[in-house]
């Protein structure tokens, strides 16, 4: 048999066929589903959830549907012991506190087990002290109030407003800058967008919303207490002491209501410049402590969540591939929410229900895909993507040695302007090809294709009549995928107008508001974006599932090694003098990107011209393919991130959302100026300049002709 | 000068209907809920009925819902309530409130009110 | 719904006496507004989300609490002070109001 008659229809047919049977009034009835009650991860509702999905998966018609459980460190607030910040006057009076909770949205206040607003895994403490305003908390912003204005955070409880970087990267910054406790809070400059109504009238984030998430810095390592491993029933774990990533400090959410109260008083220096500014009515003075009158009042936090190890769940399908069984394609979302998840994580979740339902239907009509495909439900995402990094910590043999791809399916929106796509060079080609075949969902783009609304509206800033394609960097499940093994990975959503809209993310991420009724009012009535990412989405899986040659193009991932190293480069050339004095040089870097730019070039060559009819050859140059991105992984790691071994990506030191290229020497290169041992730190720019030339060179060599 | 006037109320008959009115000056009328708060004689505040910026949603007290309609003329800056089946229950002065936090309520300028009286 | 508990229901104080009034909520609420209102007039914003003072409210009034429990104070009382007092909760529908705290010079 070909390879085409293994699957039943021509691939053409296929696709075809999958895409015609995505509906959006699926994915919105699925939606609506999966959001009436709350879902926090470890919680009965979302036990009950999961096993819903892994029966409704099998009537889909997936081969096999599983539970795969793990006892993973989470975080919950003390129900009988509430959190909060309060004023405190000099006799030491609580004469003002935060809110306790959000009131409900409309049709919701009946429900219970609504978890209020925390940072997750904050440890408990009732700090006191004067406030510091950081801005974002950003490594910039320390160095600006450290340096510059020379004011000491040490022992200050500190209010930083979100956005920008991730909130695990604020508290880090602000427990090196020696603070007792530190405060998040929603500035209506980064959560409201002028001209829409707060929820339930409009998008916006109102006063007494607020974002809950995780503060940890696992860098990669899963549940806290099993680093490496997964945490199963007989696991060996860790004291708390030693648990990976958990804050020092008590750390607590609020929403612009009561940070008016916090930042109205305070005193001290003015703010450095009108960066620092948001659009409260307050001077958003920096600090130390609060102004004239109000000087003898302090700011107390009453922190008292607990860190429980609790039993999660993911949902494992499988639809077995027809001709290459042991090789896997993965489309993983998770389940769990902060409440509802109106966005996040059930507008991907039912988009994914959707593309299984669809898969299934063609699997009941006799066909089958030429690979396996894996879909996912993974629980505790919230919590420091557990269950994705348990789950894969556990196959990570299997997964290193069979994984073709992995295809992430998180929120579907964040916005309804255009598709946004992070991904492996490796993808691009797939994703452009493939964006030409669908419809654009968007006004004024009938009868066009999504990627030409998608180059108008967001274009590269490097190729003209491309679209833009992001980095990969971190805060979702295919960091371990990706980050840790090596496996070619991608995501897409709809996003929102990045040059109108400089709020982050969307204004009711995380919060109570993240209703059904914000994305069917708001977002999409008409769920047409939805089923445009699920078209997306599913169509990845499709090609890379059922492609006789997979569709990754390796030439792509040439062009950005030479992009990415002529950017370290230049910022190493900031430092002429010191290159020349420690004799710094990019040579065997660049050369070993002319290698691989040529070896590729070499391979897609023959990968035009080979016998596709010879199933050991055709398997060999597979092979190669799947096995370029896992060639970049270094088994040792980034410098004390052990489980970040992609040596070309790794989410930022400062910002874990965001991807960085050549990680390790940038990292080595960073703030090099103020490192008390020059020597020392440019030795360590020459050392990952080694690591990243050779890992380069290595990969190269995985192209070339096998003997 | 921000006002609240609302229309006569009067005597009616139970079981008959009524429409009070109030109209508003001195603020961008489409930018506010608005609301109907009354008050017994000698007692209580009690909520009535709320209504967003563009009349779009409505929101009321569940004992009254099936009787009275909230209503918003927005080109005209006039609330409505409109009160039918109307009980002796109903007796009370009907103020108009400006909401100023939106959907959650705080009522932060109120009309001088109206009186209610239903008797036969 | 939720039901707010004023106390007490009427009180009288002397002119430059500290006043609390307290209002409790069948259930935790998120903030606590509080009304003025004199015979014959409409009610007066008084305190708004929970520890605000509305536009012309003297400073001698403050608000607090959290949960289910929430306070006015006034730290020196005046004649002009004598009112009833309503608490409203904001945190879902129905919105309530409490039965009103009297409050008399003595």
């Known amino acids: 048999k070909s390879s085409n008659e293994a699957t039943n229809i021509t691939p053409k047919h296929n696709m075809k066929a999958f895409l015609d049977e995505l509906k959006a009034e699926n994915i919105k009835k699925f939606l609506y589903n999966f959001t009436q009650i709350p879902h926090l991860a470890g919680t009965e509702q979302n036990f009950q959830l999961a096993k819903q999905i892994q029966s409704q998966w099998k009537e889909f018609g997936l081969d096999s549907v599983e539970l795969a459980h793990y006892d993973v460190l989470l975080s919950y607030p003390n129900k009988t012991h509430p959190n909060y910040i309060s004023i405190i006057n000099e006799d030491g009076n609580e004469i003002f506190n935060t809110s306790l909770f959000e009131p409900p949205p409309p049709g919701y206040e009946n429900v219970s087990d609504i978890v209020p607003p925390f940072s997750a895994f904050s440890p408990q403490g009732m700090p006191e002290g004067d406030l510091v305003y950081v801005n974002y908390a950003r490594t910039e912003d320390f160095f600006k109030l450290e340096r510059d204005m020379k004011i000491n955070c040490s022992g200050k409880i500190v209010i930083a407003r979100y956005g920008k970087v991730f909130r695990g990267n604020k508290v880090k910054n602000a427990q090196l800058a020696g603070a007792k406790g530190v405060i998040l809070y929603s500035d209506p400059a980064d959560y409201f967008a002028p001209g829409v109504k707060s929820y339930p009238d409009g998008w916006n984030l109102p006063g007494g919303g607020v974002q809950r998430g995780n503060i940890l810095n696992l860098n990669g390592a899963g549940d806290p207490l099993t680093p490496g491993y997964p945490a199963n029933e007989y696991a060996y774990r860790r004291g708390i002491a030693e648990a990976v990533g958990l804050p020092s400090i008590p750390v607590h959410p609020i929403g612009y209501y009561d940070a008016q109260k916090l930042l109205e008083k305070m005193g001290g220096s003015a703010p450095p410049d009108s960066s620092w500014r948001g659009s409260l009515k307050v001077p958003y003075n920096v600090g130390p402590g609060f102004t004239g009158n109000f000087s003898t009042q302090k700011v107390k936090m009453h922190i008292h969540s607990t860190n429980e190890v609790t039993r999660i769940y993911n949902v494992i399908g499988t639809l077995r591939g027809a001709v290459e069984p042991d090789r896997y394609v993965i489309l993983g979302g998770h389940r769990d929410s902060w409440v509802f998840g109106g966005i996040d994580p059930q507008s991907g979740a039912a988009v994914v229900h959707e593309i299984v339902r669809s898969f299934g239907t063609l699997k009941k009509e006799g066909w089958r895909p030429r690979r396996t495909i894996l879909f996912a439900s993974w629980d505790a995402e919230e919590f420091g993507l557990l269950g994705s990094t348990e789950w894969a910590e556990e196959n990570s043999r299997l997964l290193q040695e069979r994984g073709v791809a992995y295809i992430n399916a998180d929120s579907s929106i964040e916005g309804n302007y255009t598709l946004r796509v992070d991904c492996t060079p490796l993808m691009y080609s797939l994703v452009h090809n493939l964006t030409k075949e669908l419809k654009s969902p968007d006004e004024g783009f009938e009868g066009k294709s999504l990627y030409e609304s998608w180059t108008k509206k967001s274009p590269s800033p490097e190729f003209s009549g491309m679209p833009r394609i992001s980095k990969l960097g971190s805060g979702n499940d295919f960091e371990v995928f990706f980050q840790r093994l090596g496996i070619a990975s991608g995501r897409a959503r709809y996003t929102k107008n990045w040059e109108t809209n400089k709020f982050s993310g969307y204004p009711l991420y995380h919060s109570v508001y993240e209703t059904y009724e914000l994305v069917e009012k708001f977002y999409d009535p008409m769920f047409k974006y939805h089923l445009t990412v699920a078209q997306v989405r599913g169509g990845m899986v499709f090609e890379l599932a059922n492609s006789i040659v997979l569709p990754f193009d390796c030439r792509d991932y040439a062009v950005v090694l030479r992009k990415y190293a002529d950017k370290i480069y230049s910022i190493s050339m900031k430092h002429p003098q010191e290159m020349k004095t420690y004799s710094v040089s990019f040579d065997s870097l660049f050369s070993a990107v002319k290698n691989f730019t040529e070896i590729a070039s070499k391979f897609s060559e023959r990968l035009q011209d080979f016998d596709k009819s010879n199933p050991i050859v055709l398997r060999m140059m597979n092979d190669q393919l799947m096995f370029l991105e896992r060639a970049f992984i270094d088994p040792l790691g980034l410098p004390d991130r052990p489980f970040y071994r992609h040596v070309i990506y790794a989410p930022s030191s400062h910002n874990k959302y965001a991807g960085e290229s050549f990680p390790g020497i940038y990292d080595a290169l960073f703030d090099i100026e103020s490192k008390v041992d020059p020597s020392k730190a440019w030795g360590e720019v020459k050392r990952q300049i080694y690591v990243a030339a050779f890992t380069v060179q290595a990969a190269a060599e995985t192209l070339s002709e096998v003997a | 000068e921000v006002k609240l006037v609302e229309s006569e109320g009067g005597l009616v008959q139970p079981g008959s209907s009524m429409k009070l009115s109030c109209t508003a000056s001195g603020f961008t009328f489409s930018d506010y809920y608005m609301a109907w708060v009354r008050q017994v004689p000698e007692k209580g505040l009690e909520w009535v009925a709320n209504?967003?910026?563009?009349?779009?949603?409505?929101y009321y007290l569940d004992s009254l819902k099936s009787r009275f309609i909230i209503s918003r003329d927005n080109a005209k800056n006039i609330l409505y309530l409109q009160m039918s089946s109307l009980k002796s229950e109903d007796t009370a002065t009907y103020y108009c409130?400006?909401?100023?936090?939106?959907?959650?309520?705080?009522?932060?300028?109120w009309g001088t009110g109206t009186t209610v009286t239903v008797s036969s | 719904q939720i039901v707010l508990t004023q106390s007490p229901a009427i009180m009288s104080a002397s002119p430059g006496e500290k006043v609390t009034i307290s209002c409790s909520a069948s259930?935790?609420?998120?903030?606590m507004y509080w009304y003025q209102q004199k015979p014959g007039s409409s009610p007066k914003p008084w305190i708004y989300r929970t520890s605000n003072l509305a536009s012309g409210v003297p400073a001698r009034f403050s608000g607090s609490g959290s949960g289910t429990s929430y306070s006015l104070t006034i730290s020196s009382m005046e004649a002009e002070d004598a009112a009833t007092y309503y608490c409203q909760q904001y945190h879902s529908y129905p919105l309530t109001f409490g039965a009103g705290t009297k409050l008399e010079l003595k």
């Open positions: 209504i967003n910026y563009d009349g779009s949603s409505t």
């Open positions: 409130a400006r909401d100023l936090d939106g959907y959650y309520g705080y009522f932060d300028v």
């Open positions: 259930s935790s609420v998120s903030y």
